[in-house]
């Protein structure tokens, strides 16, 4: 049933990192166009990406309104030349996406080490608090603002001269670790949400090493 000479979308997939959220699907359109609708479980259908020939739709503006809601999207297929045309059933073909809860499922983006500072045998490592597209009172929230104590960072650090890694964890964006005096260390961090069942960890940050510009060394 559905519209003549159109095919339903398939492989509807959510791609989301730090709440930047795009719905992707197949197939590439041949003589057809797509419109996307999105709803929460307690809300109603809102149309986006009208009559597009793309196979993706940026739904960030909708999901950031409440990242803890569960969202459902659907993709409608229409004949390219006549989007008002429908089949004998009177409605266009469509396919539903899987449900998506941004707070539980958005991928954690690769973190960045903002700075490190050595004071004697202590090093303070600071992770950049990345800005998201989630807004509150007309300001964009950081990842920490959104996740609070649900988000921790794991620091991996090792002497430049060896391969043995140590780890530290923090539920802020700062680490204070003990180091051996006179040794250079390298650092990498990973964002983690321990309470999650999926997408718990980010990829590791780029490695930063002491003796490079990003850090500051003060011998006390």
């Amino acid at each position: 049933s559905g519209t003549t000479n159109t095919v339903a979308a398939y492989n509807l997939t959510w791609k989301s990192t730090n709440f930047k959220t795009i719905l992707e699907w197949e197939p590439k359109p041949v003589n057809q166009v797509y419109t996307v609708q999105i709803s929460t479980k307690s809300g109603d259908w809102k149309s986006k990406c009208f009559y597009t020939t793309d196979t993706e739709c940026d739904l960030t503006d909708e999901i950031v309104k409440d990242v803890k809601q569960t969202y459902l999207a659907r993709v409608f297929s229409y004949p390219a030349g006549n989007v008002e045309s429908t089949g004998s059933a009177g409605e266009p073909l469509y396919e539903n996406s899987p449900e998506f809860t941004p707070y539980l499922e958005t991928n954690l983006g690769q973190p960045t080490i903002q700075s490190f500072e050595q004071v004697g045998t202590k090093v303070n490592v600071t992770v950049e608090d990345e800005r998201t597209l989630v807004r509150r009172n007309n300001t964009f929230l950081s990842l920490r603002d959104v996740f609070g104590k649900d988000l921790i960072y794991t620091l991996y650090y090792w002497k430049s001269s060896s391969s043995g890694k140590k780890t530290a964890k923090t539920n802020t964006n700062e680490f204070l670790i003990d180091v051996d005096k006179g040794e250079n260390y390298c650092f990498s961090v990973q964002a983690v949400i321990p309470s999650r069942t999926v997408n718990r960890k980010s990829t590791d940050s780029p490695v930063e090493c002491m003796g490079q510009e990003k850090g500051e060394f003060r011998e006390i």
């Epitope: 709803s39 479980k41 307690s42 809300g43 109603d44 259908w45 809102k46 309104k65 059933a89 409605e91």
Partner: antibody, heavy 118, light 107 residues
Framework: QVQLVQSGAEVKQPGASVKVSCKAS????????MHWVRQAPGQGLEWMGM????????TYAQKFQGRVTLTVDTSTSTAYMELSSLRSEDTAVYYC???????????WGQGTLVTVSS | DIQETQSPSSLSASVGDRVTITCRAS??????LNWYQQKPGKAPKLLIY???RLQSGVPSRFSGSGSGTDYTLTISSLQPEDFATYYC?????????FGQGTKVEIK
Amino acid sequence: QVQLVQSGAEVKQPGASVKVSCKASGYTFTTYWMHWVRQAPGQGLEWMGMIDPSDSYTTYAQKFQGRVTLTVDTSTSTAYMELSSLRSEDTAVYYCARGSGPGLFAYWGQGTLVTVSS
Amino acid sequence: DIQETQSPSSLSASVGDRVTITCRASQDIRNYLNWYQQKPGKAPKLLIYHTSRLQSGVPSRFSGSGSGTDYTLTISSLQPEDFATYYCQQGNMPPYTFGQGTKVEIK
């Protein structure tokens, strides 16, 4: 508890407009869509449209497109339905109904009778 | 637009009877089917949503079933307060549409 209280009955001349209000309480107004449904005397229920109070996004039934305008005032948690170019067939009870999911009307106002008569 | 056809349009029954009302949609509505009860001079009241889920506070004698295009509301043992008009409504796709109603009267 959720309550939707609508404005009182109206009598209008053909060609005039009417604006019905629906004051919501007992929940966060911007979280749920508001729908409008009408019922002509002795007839069934007819969906007119809906509005998302968080951003005033609207969807209207094609039959009412261009004649109905849905608005909200979030400061007073009030939804409004304005119907213009009234004709006798618009005589009906007009209901606001709070959505609780796609196309789901869990809570209803008491209804507002609009009579169109010359 | 999706059309709902309700049957019967009216029925007479006695207290204690089992009553079944059917609703047929013009296309697959993927279980987005709701049932409402309306008494004279009152607003409709949600009974069943998403085919079979009982709205909070609604007695368990009301139940719903169905899939695709065909849906059913059943009252297992009719009570005096159940005499009313019942409407099905599809919530799959705007414009949301209602059946024409089934009036349940006392025999």
